[in-house]
């Protein structure tokens, strides 16, 4: 039978067994025993006596020094077997054993749930010698017990290379219910069932669970822990908690908010980061996600032009990062841009629209009718061309770029010249004689450099040769022009 020493009755389990000079003569009580000063070894050690443990784990002493009589086996005396107390109380318990004085060097160690207790514990072993025996009492005290102190404690004594083990002392720390699983915040679809779980443990058991929704109890009758609450569905946000009750009182879980998923709020603060002739880099601040993760976003682009047909271009992108480069736009155009994002419920409204413009583009066509001829008297090359028919979006012509490449006997050299937009002819100095000069021209706007014209080649002879007819840009489909001398 378990002897329970509740802390309400006694502050500590009392030393129950025989003490030196006053050994046990009566086995009617394990907790408090009358004592005399006589030594009664038959009572002290006999395994047939009631009220003391005989677990089989005993040391069998050898013959006494006189060699005449055998000493009985050694065993720890009975002590309280089960201590029940509340959290934060102090507790002390002990093991005691009477050892004949012929023995030397006895050590007692404490073990909890099979592991030796070392270090930072209040354990003391006290020795009380009498004429023939020494009472050894090992006490273990715990200040302000916690649940982690729950367990089975035993003493082990080593004596003459034998090990004696006490009966276990079960420490049961009782307190308010302790949650091992609390309900978690959730985001749920409107009118869709979901479950909440609550689990709490003692001791003492049982632990009963009540569910609370928005400060009102959900279940009239408690459920034994663990408890799963099935909510058939919500139409608006609610706060749930659970109450865990045991004989010591009640503990309330954290309150958790159950949110109803909705479409997101529209993004805000759409900003332009960079514009080129054909692209615009934008960013935005996501709106509230509606308690459901964003899946993707849609960038909507409308050209702001009375002559445009008002169609909207839609570019889908991931929800993160909150940035997108809109491409394939026309140069020097105005656009209205909005962003919308979606979650599992649906699309948000579109953000406030913002205006953005692309910059000038580079020309899309090369100068026309490029002709090249040699002016030998001045030792230069004359180049003429016609202004290309550029679109408005290419912006205003600011000039031309002339590339001339000189090739002779394994040497090649490219030179670039820039001329103003009002020119349609240029002169370049002859760089090398007895060489081929290849000329190409590109129109330039603020948006960049357009494509180069097809190359026109002219041979520059050695000094003293006569002028020849010019080379010119061939008609489309013809071979590269070459001046034949």
């Amino acid at each position: 039978a378990i002897t329970e020493a509740r802390e309400e009755a006694k502050p500590y389990p009392l030393f129950p067994g025989p003490l030196p000079g006053s050994l046990q003569t009566d086995h009617t009580s394990l907790l408090s025993l009358p004592h005399t000063s006589g030594y009664q070894p038959a009572l002290m050690f006999s395994p047939t006596q009631p009220g003391r443990p005989y677990t089989g784990n005993v040391a069998i002493p050898r013959v006494t020094s006189a060699g005449s009589k055998l000493l009985p086996p050694l065993a720890f005396k009975h002590t309280v077997g089960h201590i029940i107390l509340s959290e934060h109380k102090d507790v002390k318990f002990n093991c005691s054993i009477s050892v004949p004085n012929i023995y030397q060097d006895t050590t007692i160690s404490w073990w909890k749930d099979g592991k030796e207790l070392l270090g930072a514990h209040h354990a003391i072993t006290q020795f009380y010698p009498d004429d023939e025996v020494t009472a050894i009492i090992a006490s273990f005290s715990i200040t302000s017990v916690q649940r982690s102190d729950n367990g089975s404690y035993i003493c082990k004594m080593k004596i003459n290379n034998e090990e004696i083990v006490s009966d276990p002392i079960y420490i049961e720390v009782q307190g308010l219910p302790h949650f091992t699983k609390q309900p978690e915040s959730m985001n749920v679809t409107r009118n869709t069932a979901f479950n909440l779980t609550c689990q709490a443990v003692g001791p003492p058991e049982p632990v009963n669970i009540f569910w609370v929704q928005n400060s009102s109890r959900v279940n009239e009758q408690p459920e034994k822990s663990p408890s799963v609450l099935t909510v058939p569905g919500l139409t608006e946000m609610a706060v749930f908690s659970c109450e865990a009750h045991n004989d010591k009182g009640l503990t309330v879980s954290k309150g958790v908010q159950i949110n109803i998923k909705a479409i997101p709020s529209p993004p805000t603060e759409v900003s332009i980061h960079n514009s080129t002739a054909h692209s615009i880099l934008i960013s935005w601040v996501p709106g509230f996600d509606g308690y459901s993760p964003f899946r993707n976003c849609s960038v909507q682009v409308k050209e702001v032009d009375p002559l445009s047909n008002g169609s909207v271009m839609i570019f889908n992108t991931s929800a993160s990062p909150h940035m997108y480069q809109i491409k394939q736009l026309q140069a020097l155009a105005n656009y209205s841009i909005g962003v919308s994002c979606m979650n599992e419920i649906g699309w948000s409204a579109v953000s406030p629209w913002i205006l953005a413009s692309t910059t000038e583009g580079a020309p899309s066509v090369a100068p026309l009718n490029v002709t090249v001829f040699l002016n030998e008297s001045r030792d230069n090359v004359d180049i003429r061309w016609m202004k290309p028919l550029t679109k408005r979006q290419a912006g205003e012509l600011v000039g031309y770029r002339i590339s001339h490449v000189w090739q002779s006997a394994g040497i090649s050299k490219e030179l670039l010249e820039e001329v103003g937009q009002n020119n349609s002819r240029a002169q370049i100095s002859v760089q090398v004689h007895n060489a081929t000069c290849t000329v190409r021209i590109a129109a330039v706007t603020k948006g960049g450099v357009g494509p180069f014209s097809d190359p026109v080649k002219i041979f520059i002879p050695a000094h003293g040769w006569v002028d020849h007819a010019p080379s010119s840009t061939p008609a489309p489909g013809n071979a590269d022009p070459v001046l034949i001398i």
Epitope: K10, P11, Y12, L14, F15, L19, G21, S22, S32, L33, P34, H35, S37, K92, N94, H122, I124, T125, Q126, F127, Y128, P129, I137, S139, S141
Partner: antibody, heavy 122, light 106 residues
Amino acid sequence: QLQLQESGPGLVKPSETLSLTCAVSGYSISSGNYWGWIRQSPGKGLEWIGSVDHSGSTYYSPSLKSRVTISVDTSKNQFSLKLNSVTAADTADYYCARNTMIRGVMDWFDPWGQGTLVTVSS
Amino acid sequence: AIQLTQSPSSLSASVGDRVTITCRASQGISSALAWYQQKPGKAPKVLIYDASSLESGVPSRFSGSGSGTDFTLTISSLQPEDFATYYCQQFRSYPTFGQGTKVEIK
């Protein structure tokens, strides 16, 4: 709070029995702890005599064991000391005290009574 | 029985001095030692238990240390009310006391 008060004759004849009682107030002896007697000869150090718990379990000093009896009366919340065959060497201040059980079975003494002087003389 | 030997038997010191009293046990007693202060005509009062734990209400200038056989009581800055006799007591076995150290005014 817990208080202890010694009482008994201040003069005992040699070879007779010294008897003292310690009354405990502010605490029930039955609640636990050992209750001890300590003496202090004039100008000398402290000597533990013995201790008793609420059930009558006793510890005695090995040097005095043959002459000492300590008993408890829980109904009166008191405990007593009897020391027989006294001699002049037993003249001392006798203190009763609670033996704390915070660490072990008998630890330090706290609190103490104020003490009573017993003289052994014919 | 376990014998406790205190040293010195007596000492003279001034207010503000640091005072150290030692207690040696005849065999190992772990940390099962207490220190007491006794003033003339009064009962002893516990200062330190478990060799180094300060009893509630005792000024922090008192401290204890040691384990096994050698123990020390230190008064960091002696005050007028500290002139008294100090005793150590072991509780590893039957309680025994040291012979006492008397702290007197220099």
